[in-house]
Protein backbone atom coordinates (compact mmCIF):
# COMPACT_ATOMS: atom_id res chain seq x y z
CA UNK A 1 0.00 0.00 0.00
CA UNK A 2 1.23 3.48 -0.83
CA UNK A 3 0.63 4.74 2.71
CA UNK A 4 2.54 1.86 4.30
CA UNK A 5 6.21 2.13 5.04
CA UNK A 6 9.02 0.70 2.96
CA UNK A 7 12.65 1.32 3.76
CA UNK A 8 15.87 0.31 2.05
CA UNK A 9 19.05 1.01 4.00
CA UNK A 10 22.59 0.07 3.05
CA UNK A 11 26.04 0.59 4.55
CA UNK A 12 29.53 0.19 3.13
CA UNK A 13 32.19 -1.38 5.33
CA UNK A 14 34.83 0.80 3.58
CA UNK A 15 36.46 -2.11 1.73
CA UNK A 16 34.51 -4.79 -0.18
CA UNK A 17 31.10 -5.25 1.43
CA UNK A 18 27.77 -3.41 1.20
CA UNK A 19 25.19 -4.68 3.69
CA UNK A 20 21.53 -3.92 2.98
CA UNK A 21 18.20 -4.22 4.78
CA UNK A 22 14.85 -3.98 3.00
CA UNK A 23 11.71 -3.63 5.10
CA UNK A 24 8.14 -3.46 3.87
CA UNK A 25 4.97 -3.49 5.93
CA UNK A 26 2.53 -6.15 4.84
CA UNK A 27 4.91 -7.98 2.51
CA UNK A 28 4.69 -11.75 2.27
CA UNK A 29 7.49 -13.57 4.07
CA UNK A 30 8.13 -15.90 1.13
CA UNK A 31 8.53 -13.07 -1.38
CA UNK A 32 11.70 -13.53 -3.43
CA UNK A 33 13.75 -10.32 -3.56
CA UNK A 34 17.28 -9.34 -4.55
CA UNK A 35 19.57 -6.34 -4.31
CA UNK A 36 21.44 -5.35 -7.47
CA UNK A 37 24.46 -3.05 -7.34
CA UNK A 38 25.58 -1.10 -10.43
CA UNK A 39 28.57 1.22 -9.91
CA UNK A 40 28.78 4.25 -12.19
CA UNK A 41 32.50 3.89 -12.96
CA UNK A 42 33.37 0.21 -12.45
CA UNK A 43 33.20 -2.79 -14.77
CA UNK A 44 31.64 -5.08 -12.20
CA UNK A 45 28.10 -5.40 -10.86
CA UNK A 46 26.86 -7.54 -8.01
CA UNK A 47 23.68 -9.20 -6.72
CA UNK A 48 22.63 -10.70 -3.41
CA UNK A 49 19.52 -12.58 -2.34
CA UNK A 50 17.51 -10.89 0.41
CA UNK A 51 16.81 -13.33 3.23
CA UNK A 52 14.22 -12.79 5.97
CA UNK A 53 15.51 -11.48 9.30
CA UNK A 54 12.14 -10.61 10.86
CA UNK A 55 8.44 -10.52 10.04
CA UNK A 56 8.77 -7.64 7.57
CA UNK A 57 12.47 -7.20 6.86
CA UNK A 58 15.10 -8.88 4.71
CA UNK A 59 18.88 -8.51 4.59
CA UNK A 60 21.83 -9.42 2.42
CA UNK A 61 25.50 -8.67 1.84
CA UNK A 62 26.92 -7.56 -1.48
CA UNK A 63 30.40 -9.11 -1.57
CA UNK A 64 32.41 -6.92 -3.93
CA UNK A 65 35.73 -8.73 -3.73
CA UNK A 66 38.41 -10.00 -1.37
CA UNK A 67 37.74 -8.75 2.19
CA UNK A 68 40.62 -6.27 2.31
CA UNK A 69 40.43 -5.06 -1.28
CA UNK A 70 39.50 -1.39 -1.83
CA UNK A 71 36.57 -1.76 -4.24
CA UNK A 72 35.06 1.74 -4.00
CA UNK A 73 36.27 5.30 -3.43
CA UNK A 74 34.77 8.60 -2.32
CA UNK A 75 33.86 9.53 -5.90
CA UNK A 76 31.91 6.35 -6.68
CA UNK A 77 28.14 6.25 -6.92
CA UNK A 78 26.54 2.81 -6.79
CA UNK A 79 22.95 2.44 -7.95
CA UNK A 80 21.31 -0.05 -5.61
CA UNK A 81 17.96 -1.58 -6.53
CA UNK A 82 15.60 -3.89 -4.68
CA UNK A 83 13.88 -6.22 -7.14
CA UNK A 84 11.11 -8.55 -6.03
CA UNK A 85 9.53 -11.32 -8.06
CA UNK A 86 5.88 -10.75 -8.93
CA UNK A 87 4.63 -13.71 -10.93
CA UNK A 88 6.87 -14.09 -13.95
CA UNK A 89 8.59 -10.69 -13.73
CA UNK A 90 10.89 -8.79 -11.40
CA UNK A 91 9.56 -5.48 -10.09
CA UNK A 92 11.80 -2.66 -8.87
CA UNK A 93 10.69 -1.82 -5.32
CA UNK A 94 13.35 0.66 -4.23
CA UNK A 95 16.27 2.58 -5.70
CA UNK A 96 19.17 4.36 -4.06
CA UNK A 97 22.02 6.23 -5.70
CA UNK A 98 24.44 5.26 -3.00
CA UNK A 99 27.57 7.22 -2.09
CA UNK A 100 29.59 4.60 -0.22
CA UNK A 101 31.71 6.96 1.87
CA UNK A 102 28.61 8.85 3.04
CA UNK A 103 27.08 5.60 4.34
CA UNK A 104 29.78 3.84 6.31
CA UNK A 105 29.52 1.16 8.95
CA UNK A 106 32.77 -0.62 9.69
CA UNK A 107 33.20 -4.18 10.86
CA UNK A 108 33.32 -4.70 14.61
CA UNK A 109 36.80 -4.44 16.14
CA UNK A 110 38.58 -7.78 16.57
CA UNK A 111 41.44 -9.40 18.47
CA UNK A 112 40.56 -7.89 21.83
CA UNK A 113 43.11 -8.87 24.44
CA UNK A 114 44.17 -8.02 27.95
CA UNK A 115 47.61 -6.43 27.80
CA UNK A 116 48.00 -6.01 31.54
CA UNK A 117 45.70 -6.44 34.50
CA UNK A 118 46.05 -5.31 38.13
CA UNK A 119 43.74 -5.08 41.12
CA UNK A 120 42.08 -1.79 40.09
CA UNK A 121 42.97 -1.38 36.45
CA UNK A 122 43.19 -3.26 33.19
CA UNK A 123 44.84 -2.33 29.89
CA UNK A 124 43.05 -3.73 26.83
CA UNK A 125 43.97 -3.52 23.15
CA UNK A 126 42.10 -4.36 19.93
CA UNK A 127 42.40 -4.14 16.14
CA UNK A 128 40.15 -2.72 13.46
CA UNK A 129 39.08 -5.07 10.69
CA UNK A 130 38.72 -4.36 6.96
CA UNK A 131 38.97 -0.60 7.43
CA UNK A 132 40.02 1.53 4.49
CA UNK A 133 43.43 3.15 4.47
CA UNK A 134 41.63 6.32 3.31
CA UNK A 135 40.64 7.07 6.90
CA UNK A 136 44.25 7.38 8.02
CA UNK A 137 43.66 8.32 11.67
CA UNK A 138 40.17 9.76 11.28
CA UNK A 139 38.34 7.22 13.41
CA UNK A 140 36.72 7.30 16.83
CA UNK A 141 35.83 4.54 19.28
CA UNK A 142 33.29 3.89 21.99
CA UNK A 143 33.90 1.34 24.73
CA UNK A 144 31.85 -0.06 27.59
CA UNK A 145 32.54 -2.31 30.55
CA UNK A 146 30.02 -4.71 32.01
CA UNK A 147 30.17 -4.81 35.80
CA UNK A 148 28.64 -7.55 37.95
CA UNK A 149 24.90 -7.09 38.50
CA UNK A 150 24.47 -4.67 35.59
CA UNK A 151 23.38 -4.89 31.95
CA UNK A 152 25.22 -3.67 28.86
CA UNK A 153 22.61 -0.96 28.43
CA UNK A 154 23.45 0.42 31.88
CA UNK A 155 27.18 0.53 31.18
CA UNK A 156 28.53 4.06 30.73
CA UNK A 157 30.08 4.79 27.35
CA UNK A 158 33.73 5.73 27.17
CA UNK A 159 34.57 7.83 24.12
CA UNK A 160 37.95 7.82 22.40
CA UNK A 161 37.98 10.73 19.96
CA UNK A 162 41.01 9.49 18.06
CA UNK A 163 42.40 6.33 16.48
CA UNK A 164 43.52 4.75 19.73
CA UNK A 165 43.35 0.97 19.74
CA UNK A 166 43.81 0.49 23.45
CA UNK A 167 42.28 1.66 26.70
CA UNK A 168 43.28 1.65 30.35
CA UNK A 169 40.25 0.91 32.52
CA UNK A 170 40.63 2.27 36.03
CA UNK A 171 38.79 2.30 39.38
CA UNK A 172 37.93 -1.37 38.99
CA UNK A 173 37.12 -3.63 41.91
CA UNK A 174 39.71 -6.27 42.89
CA UNK A 175 39.05 -9.93 42.15
CA UNK A 176 36.01 -9.14 40.01
CA UNK A 177 34.85 -10.53 36.69
CA UNK A 178 34.20 -7.94 33.96
CA UNK A 179 33.39 -7.90 30.27
CA UNK A 180 34.50 -5.29 27.77
CA UNK A 181 33.29 -4.24 24.30
CA UNK A 182 34.39 -1.63 21.78
CA UNK A 183 33.00 -0.22 18.52
CA UNK A 184 34.38 2.08 15.84
CA UNK A 185 33.12 4.86 13.59
CA UNK A 186 34.80 6.90 10.86
CA UNK A 187 34.44 10.67 11.13
CA UNK A 188 33.49 10.81 7.44
CA UNK A 189 29.96 10.48 6.02
CA UNK A 190 26.59 12.13 6.55
CA UNK A 191 24.83 8.84 7.26
CA UNK A 192 27.78 6.95 8.76
CA UNK A 193 26.96 4.96 11.87
CA UNK A 194 28.75 2.96 14.57
CA UNK A 195 30.05 -0.50 13.83
CA UNK A 196 28.48 -3.39 15.70
CA UNK A 197 29.95 -3.95 19.15
CA UNK A 198 32.92 -6.28 19.28
CA UNK A 199 32.63 -9.70 20.78
CA UNK A 200 32.87 -9.23 24.56
CA UNK A 201 36.23 -9.79 26.19
CA UNK A 202 36.00 -11.33 29.64
CA UNK A 203 38.67 -10.55 32.21
CA UNK A 204 39.15 -10.69 35.97
CA UNK A 205 41.00 -8.16 38.11
CA UNK A 206 43.66 -9.44 40.46
CA UNK A 207 42.72 -9.99 44.09
CA UNK A 208 43.92 -7.43 46.59
CA UNK A 209 47.05 -8.49 48.44
CA UNK A 210 46.21 -9.81 51.91
CA UNK A 211 46.74 -7.29 54.71
CA UNK A 212 47.32 -4.42 52.30
CA UNK A 213 45.03 -1.56 51.42
CA UNK A 214 45.26 -1.41 47.65
Amino acid sequence: AVNGTSQFTCFYNSRANISCVWSQDGALQDTSCQVHAWPDRRRWNQTCELLPVSQASWACNLILGAPDSQKLTTVDIVTLRVLCREGVRWRVMAIQDFKPFENLRLMAPISLQVVHVETHRCNISWEISQASHYFERHLEFEARTLSPGHTWEEAPLLTLKQKQEWICLETLTPDTQYEFQVRVKPLQGEFTTWSPWSQPLAFRTKPAALGKDT
Partner: nanobody
Protein backbone atom coordinates in the same frame (compact mmCIF):
# COMPACT_ATOMS: atom_id res chain seq x y z
CA UNK B 1 13.21 22.14 5.45
CA UNK B 2 12.30 21.92 1.76
CA UNK B 3 9.58 23.99 0.17
CA UNK B 4 8.03 22.48 -2.96
CA UNK B 5 5.72 24.21 -5.43
CA UNK B 6 4.03 22.39 -8.30
CA UNK B 7 2.86 24.02 -11.52
CA UNK B 8 1.83 23.09 -15.07
CA UNK B 9 -1.49 21.42 -14.36
CA UNK B 10 -4.61 22.12 -16.38
CA UNK B 11 -7.32 20.73 -18.61
CA UNK B 12 -6.25 18.57 -21.55
CA UNK B 13 -7.96 16.20 -23.95
CA UNK B 14 -7.35 12.47 -23.85
CA UNK B 15 -4.22 11.61 -25.81
CA UNK B 16 -2.70 15.02 -25.08
CA UNK B 17 0.38 16.00 -23.07
CA UNK B 18 1.28 18.15 -20.08
CA UNK B 19 4.53 18.92 -18.32
CA UNK B 20 4.39 19.44 -14.57
CA UNK B 21 7.15 21.27 -12.70
CA UNK B 22 8.18 21.00 -9.08
CA UNK B 23 10.30 23.93 -7.94
CA UNK B 24 12.23 23.50 -4.71
CA UNK B 25 13.88 25.79 -2.21
CA UNK B 26 15.51 25.13 1.14
CA UNK B 27 17.47 21.97 1.87
CA UNK B 28 20.22 21.13 -0.62
CA UNK B 29 18.12 20.12 -3.59
CA UNK B 30 20.94 18.54 -5.58
CA UNK B 31 21.21 15.71 -3.03
CA UNK B 32 17.46 15.18 -2.56
CA UNK B 33 15.48 12.42 -4.27
CA UNK B 34 12.02 13.56 -5.43
CA UNK B 35 8.79 11.69 -6.10
CA UNK B 36 5.46 12.43 -7.75
CA UNK B 37 2.16 11.20 -6.31
CA UNK B 38 -1.43 11.79 -7.35
CA UNK B 39 -4.85 11.67 -5.72
CA UNK B 40 -8.07 11.28 -7.67
CA UNK B 41 -11.40 12.28 -6.10
CA UNK B 42 -12.54 9.70 -3.56
CA UNK B 43 -9.33 7.66 -3.91
CA UNK B 44 -6.14 7.27 -1.89
CA UNK B 45 -2.99 9.08 -2.91
CA UNK B 46 -0.89 6.86 -5.20
CA UNK B 47 2.73 6.78 -6.29
CA UNK B 48 3.40 7.96 -9.86
CA UNK B 49 7.15 8.33 -10.41
CA UNK B 50 10.41 9.30 -8.71
CA UNK B 51 13.94 10.32 -9.56
CA UNK B 52 17.15 10.08 -7.56
CA UNK B 53 19.31 13.08 -6.70
CA UNK B 54 21.88 12.23 -9.38
CA UNK B 55 19.31 11.48 -12.12
CA UNK B 56 20.94 8.05 -12.49
CA UNK B 57 17.73 6.24 -11.58
CA UNK B 58 13.99 6.59 -12.00
CA UNK B 59 11.03 4.58 -10.75
CA UNK B 60 7.51 4.49 -12.21
CA UNK B 61 4.09 3.12 -11.33
CA UNK B 62 2.98 0.39 -13.70
CA UNK B 63 0.03 2.53 -14.81
CA UNK B 64 2.25 5.31 -16.20
CA UNK B 65 5.33 3.40 -17.36
CA UNK B 66 6.13 4.32 -20.97
CA UNK B 67 3.82 7.35 -20.94
CA UNK B 68 5.29 9.53 -18.19
CA UNK B 69 8.93 10.61 -17.83
CA UNK B 70 10.48 12.18 -14.75
CA UNK B 71 13.56 14.36 -15.16
CA UNK B 72 15.34 17.03 -13.13
CA UNK B 73 17.48 20.11 -13.58
CA UNK B 74 19.50 20.62 -10.42
CA UNK B 75 20.83 23.98 -11.60
CA UNK B 76 17.23 25.23 -11.60
CA UNK B 77 16.18 23.31 -8.47
CA UNK B 78 13.35 21.78 -10.47
CA UNK B 79 11.95 18.32 -11.18
CA UNK B 80 9.67 17.72 -14.17
CA UNK B 81 6.98 15.17 -14.95
CA UNK B 82 6.35 14.90 -18.68
CA UNK B 83 2.95 13.25 -19.18
CA UNK B 84 2.10 11.95 -22.65
CA UNK B 85 -0.83 9.91 -24.01
CA UNK B 86 -2.96 11.14 -21.14
CA UNK B 87 -6.10 9.20 -20.22
CA UNK B 88 -9.22 10.28 -18.30
CA UNK B 89 -8.07 8.01 -15.44
CA UNK B 90 -4.99 10.23 -15.05
CA UNK B 91 -7.27 12.98 -13.73
CA UNK B 92 -6.07 13.86 -10.22
CA UNK B 93 -4.27 16.37 -8.08
CA UNK B 94 -0.53 15.78 -8.60
CA UNK B 95 1.92 16.31 -5.72
CA UNK B 96 5.69 16.32 -5.61
CA UNK B 97 7.49 15.21 -2.47
CA UNK B 98 11.05 15.07 -1.16
CA UNK B 99 12.48 11.77 0.04
CA UNK B 100 13.65 11.79 3.66
CA UNK B 101 17.39 12.32 4.10
CA UNK B 102 19.18 8.99 4.05
CA UNK B 103 16.17 7.07 2.73
CA UNK B 104 15.85 5.34 -0.62
CA UNK B 105 13.31 6.05 -3.34
CA UNK B 106 10.31 3.79 -2.77
CA UNK B 107 6.63 3.76 -3.70
CA UNK B 108 5.24 4.45 -0.23
CA UNK B 109 4.39 7.83 1.29
CA UNK B 110 6.24 7.22 4.56
CA UNK B 111 9.60 7.71 2.85
CA UNK B 112 8.74 11.30 1.90
CA UNK B 113 8.81 14.15 4.40
CA UNK B 114 8.09 17.39 2.52
CA UNK B 115 5.15 17.84 0.16
CA UNK B 116 3.92 20.48 -2.26
CA UNK B 117 0.36 21.77 -2.28
CA UNK B 118 -0.52 20.00 -5.53
CA UNK B 119 -1.59 20.94 -9.04
CA UNK B 120 -4.83 19.80 -10.68
CA UNK B 121 -4.69 17.74 -13.88
CA UNK B 122 -7.99 17.07 -15.67
CA UNK B 123 -8.14 14.82 -18.74
CA UNK B 124 -11.39 15.01 -20.70
CA UNK B 125 -12.58 12.15 -22.85
Amino acid sequence: QVQLVESGGGLVQAGGSLRLSCAASGRTFSTTDVGWFRQAPGKEREFVAAITWSSHSTLYADSVEGRFTVTRENAKNTVYLQMNSLKPEDTAVYYCAAVRRGWAVVRTEGAYDFWGQGTQVTVSA
